[in-house]
């Protein structure tokens, strides 16, 4: 039978508002049918929408009645309308896209790392620290020390010595491990993995006990 276009999967078109983090891929679908087979076109905020209108372009998959945008950015926010038509009629559906900018945050350290260790005098020890960060993180391994019998400075901040810092020649894997060789009783104490980026620092600590 000949006839105007109609939606073939209206249940898949219920979600009219789509909010996605920046850099994600977005796909809008308007599965339809009709006789003759209808055409599909897309509008953004009521105007014709073509690939040259956005950096990275768009993918129009007519067989799947879909519009795909990869690596969305805040400027992709807006109302997207599919227009499905043949000579007997026209139908349309509007979706609203919101692009969520990822809020920058301090590095995130994996829970439970580094872990407390007990080692025999003269043995080797490794502390591990797993860091997740959007912005490039810098990692420092710190050893807590005493100064004139005190563990903290005049303002209450703990005294520390830097054991290892991120370097241009240091891989993430190297940084995420602190290796102590041939441990002595002086190596016993508190160790901290400190990760920083432009937002701030995060830190986890662990203790080393050295047995005779």
């Amino acid at each position: 039978d000949t006839g105007a276009p109609y939606w073939t999967r209206p249940e898949r078109m219920d979600k009219k508002l789509l909010a996605v983090p920046a850099a994600n891929t977005v796909r809008f679908r308007c599965p339809a049918a009709g006789n003759p087979t209808p055409s599909i076109s897309w509008l953004k905020n009521g105007r014709e929408f073509r690939g040259e209108h956005r950096i990275g372009g768009i993918k129009l998959r007519h067989q799947q009645w879909s519009l795909v945008m990869e690596s969305v950015v805040p400027s992709d926010r807006g109302n997207y309308t599919c227009v499905v038509e043949n000579k007997f009629g026209s139908i349309r559906q509007t979706y609203t896209l919101d692009v969520l900018e990822r809020s920058p945050h301090r590095p995130i350290l994996q829970a439970g790392l580094p872990a407390n260790q007990t080692a025999v005098l003269g043995s080797d020890v490794e502390f591990h620290c797993k860091v997740y960060s959007d912005a490039q993180p810098h990692i420092q391994w710190l050893k807590h020390v005493e100064v004139n019998g005190s563990k903290v400075g005049p303002d209450g901040t703990p005294y520390v010595t830097v054991l290892k810092t991120a370097g241009a020649n240091t891989t993430d894997k190297e940084l995420e491990v602190l290796s102590l060789h041939n441990v002595t009783f002086e190596d016993a104490g508190e160790y901290t993995c400190l990760a920083g980026n432009s937002i701030g620092f995060s830190h986890h600590s662990a203790w080393l006990v050295v047995l005779p």
């Epitope: 400075g153 901040t157 005294y159 520390v160 010595t161 830097v162 810092t165 701030g200």
Partner: antibody
Framework: QVQLVQSGAEVKKPGASVKVSCKAS????????MHWVRQAPGQGLEWMGW????????NYAQKFQGRVTMTRDTSISTAYMELSSLRSEDTAVYYC???????????????????WGQGTLVTVSS | DIALTQPASVSGSPGQSITISCTGT?????????VSWYQQHPGKAPKLMIY???NRPSGVSNRFSGSKSGNTASLTISGLQAEDEADYYC????????FGGGTKLTVLG
């Protein structure tokens, strides 16, 4: 990006005081130490002290004890260095400098200065 | 104040390698890997070139390298270029900052 913007040049009379400001942007001000370093004309770098913007704690070089005061205003991400009882030999460019070390700790060994302000020329002349 | 000792000046021709030394004691340079190097062009603020003896910050040319032997740290600049002409300062952190006296690098020719 990290920026440290200092106040403008000052001319002071001997015996007076000067207060230099340093506005930080591009990072969380309270997370990193701020150091002050000066450089007399044609001379090398001379460390004056640091302030922990998180706690307000300070550590001054022995040479400047009693004459220097370092403060901060976290609401506007700004550090200040005030030097009193000025003499002609205090004529120098004064730099604020961010120290790569978390303000949660007191660094006994290690750490380094990674960003510097543009410098403030203080001239002491009668 | 304790200071680190640097030569007052060094020079080299374009394309050559030069090394600037920074001598301290076993309490600072010798005992720990905490020496930084800064480059300062006339009228400009210092710029971090090397930290923790041999680490290069991102954006610094790999022509700059750092090392340490005993109580002496060294900054080596290979493939010398005209824009390398500047003052260079070493620095160590031990409770407080200690700077070297500075070395003036002249690029000849």
């Amino acid at each position: 990006q990290v920026q440290l913007v200092q106040s403008g040049a000052e001319v002071k009379k001997p015996g007076a005081s000067v207060k230099v400001s340093c506005k930080a942007s591009g990072y969380t001000f309270t997370s990193y130490y701020m150091h002050w370093v000066r450089q007399a004309p044609g001379q090398g770098l001379e460390w004056m002290g640091w302030i922990n913007p998180n706690s307000g704690g300070t550590n001054y070089a022995q040479k400047f004890q009693g004459r220097v005061t370092m403060t901060r205003d976290t609401s506007i991400s700004t550090a200040y260095m005030e030097l009193s009882s000025l003499r002609s030999e205090d004529t120098a460019v004064y730099y604020c400098a961010r120290y790569y070390g978390s303000s949660l700790y007191h660094y006994v060994f290690g750490g380094f200065i990674d960003y510097w302000g543009q410098g403030t020329l203080v001239t002491v002349s009668s | 104040d304790i200071a680190l000792t640097q030569p007052a000046s060094v020079s080299g021709s374009p394309g050559q390698s030069i090394t600037i030394s920074c001598t301290g004691t076993s309490s600072d340079v010798g005992g720990y890997n905490y020496v930084s190097w800064y480059q300062q062009h006339p009228g400009k603020a210092p710029k971090l070139m090397i930290y923790d003896v041999s680490n290069r910050p991102s954006g610094v040319s790999n022509r700059f390298s750092g090392s340490k032997s005993g109580n002496t740290a060294s900054l080596t600049i290979s493939g010398l270029q005209a824009e390398d002409e500047a003052d260079y300062y070493c620095q160590s952190h031990h409770f407080y900052e200690v700077f070297g006296g500075g070395t003036k690098l002249t690029v000849l020719g």
